[in-house]
Interface confidence: medium
């Protein structure tokens, strides 16, 4: 039996700049029941606070609701492990919420096969920003990528679309079924996971409808 091993805060993420969660790896428990507490201070403040919510985001996590989240302050976060033989503290993590944004994927992905006047067909891909992001006010500037592949292909073909929420894909093979996904990234954050997969078959004999 021994004091607990040093815990490690391994991830902090915010979906929207309004809330965030940090998760930690406990380290060894020294063979004894071990309690973990996350404490934080904010830059320029003397006070130290304990995690406001250990439950919402699951085991070994701390959730900071709107009430506890500020993008104007740096959070200095540590996790403390304690058992009856002693205690151990993680290295501090300096968290600027604006840097840890990982949004939900774009929504309402729609796929449509269209035809130009010269009979050339293309796939028109459209989507909407994730629900929680306030793109219109400039609070978020969102960039997007789409990826597609035919059912038979091993590799995805990725297209960066900038701030556009639509994209036209040319040179697709008739008779093939294509899978499409989108993802997004805020100005200073990280790419969302790829969104729900949609599929569409490119017709062999596409005729333009009125």
């Amino acid at each position: 039996q021994s004091p607990p091993g040093k815990p490690e805060i391994h991830k902090c993420r915010s979906p929207d700049k309004e809330t965030f969660t940090c998760w930690w790896n406990p380290g060894s428990d020294g063979g004894l029941p071990t309690n973990y507490s996350l404490t934080y201070s904010k830059e320029g403040e003397k006070n130290t606070y304990e995690c406001p919510d250990y439950k919402t985001s699951g085991p070994n996590s701390c959730f900071f609701s709107k009430q506890y989240t500020s993008i104007w302050k740096i959070y200095i976060i540590t996790v403390n492990a304690t058992n009856e033989m002693g205690s151990s503290t993680s290295d501090p993590l300096y968290v600027d919420v604006t840097y840890i944004v990982e949004p939900e994927p774009p929504r309402n992905l729609t796929l449509e096969v269209k035809q130009l006047k010269d009979k050339k067909t293309y796939l028109w891909v459209k989507w909407l920003p994730p629900t929680i992001t306030d793109v219109k006010t400039g609070w978020f500037t969102m960039e997007y990528e789409i990826r597609l592949k035919s059912e038979e292909a091993d590799e995805w073909e990725i297209h960066f679309t900038g701030h556009q929420t639509q994209f036209k894909v040319f040179d697709l093979y008739p008779g093939q079924k294509y899978l499409v996904q989108t993802r997004c990234k805020p100005d200073h954050g990280y790419w969302s996971r790829w969104g729900q997969e949609k599929s569409i078959e490119i017709p062999n004999d596409f005729t333009l409808k009125d």
């Epitope: 993008i71 104007w72 300096y94 600027d96 840097y99």
Partner: antibody, heavy 120, light 112 residues
Framework: QVQLQQSGPGLVAPSQSLSITCTVS????????VNWVRQPPGKGLEWLGI???????NYNSALMSRLSISKDNSKSQVFLKMNSLQTDDTAMYYC??????????????WGQGTLVTVSA | DIVMTQTPLSLPVSLGDQASISCRSS???????????LEWYLQKPGQSPKLLIY???NRFSGVPDRFSGSGSGTDFTLKISRVEAEDLGVYYC?????????FGGGTKLELK
């Protein structure tokens, strides 16, 4: 504890390229950005560029065409490559880790520096 | 690119004096997220630079409280309340708000 260890050649011939490796310990490259900064002898500091936790890069616009920053997360190594060196590229080259988790500036931890002399 | 201008170039002091270094940016360095990423570094001869202050006024861990930063918009100041021998060296301001990030030219704090 956090450490950044640099290795690279001390002497580079004009028009040749430079490669410096920054090997880090005490933190993961998937959680912190690493910057490169240089300092010509007797002069001030110049920011060269950054590779972020997610692998995205930003460069000093004046050097962008000659500069490339990459990394190998599994080996905890960050690489600086610079092409077409001239005598005015003679400098001490530093790698430096960001203070903020997933952040960029605030160079809290620095390598020891690699002195690069460009000379025939 | 944003130009960071430091004054004075050289600052002769006596130990125990108060020292003040000014840094002015050629345009506002308020980031699009509302924060101001203005930093101060100290470099002693033959050493790598060290972070003193981040986000205008926040001391990095281990930095003595005789160091303080202030300012907003385009005008920023680093103050040392009572200069000690270990404070001598070259001080650099730095903006990390707008790429390409830029350093000031440096201010040498030296004994009179």
């Amino acid at each position: 504890q956090v450490q950044l260890q640099q290795s690279g050649p001390g002497l580079v011939a004009p028009s040749q390229s430079l490669s410096i490796t920054c090997t880090v310990s005490g933190f993961s490259l998937t959680s912190y950005g690493v910057n490169w900064v240089r300092q010509p002898p007797g002069k001030g500091l110049e920011w060269l560029g950054i590779i972020g936790a997610g692998g995205s890069t930003n460069y000093n616009s004046a050097l962008m065409s000659r500069l490339s920053i990459s990394k190998d997360n599994s080996k905890s190594q960050v690489f600086l490559k610079m092409n077409s060196l001239q005598t005015d590229d003679t400098a001490m080259y530093y790698c430096a880790r960001s203070l903020y988790y997933y952040g960029s500036s605030s160079f809290a931890y620095w390598g020891q520096g690699t002195l690069v002399t460009v000379s025939a | 690119d944003i130009v960071m201008t430091q004054t004075p170039l050289s600052l002769p002091v006596s130990l125990g004096d108060q020292a003040s270094i000014s840094c002015r940016s050629s345009q506002s360095i308020v980031h699009s997220n509302g924060n101001t990423y203005l930093e101060w570094y100290l470099q002693k001869p033959g050493q790598s630079p060290k972070l003193l202050i981040y986000k205008v006024s926040n001391r990095f861990s281990g930095v003595p409280d005789r160091f303080s930063g202030s300012g907003s918009g385009t005008d920023f100041t680093l103050k040392i309340s009572r200069v000690e021998a270990e404070d001598l060296g070259v001080y650099y301001c730095f903006q990390g708000s707008h790429v390409p990030w830029t350093f000031g030219g440096g201010t040498k704090l030296e004994l009179k």
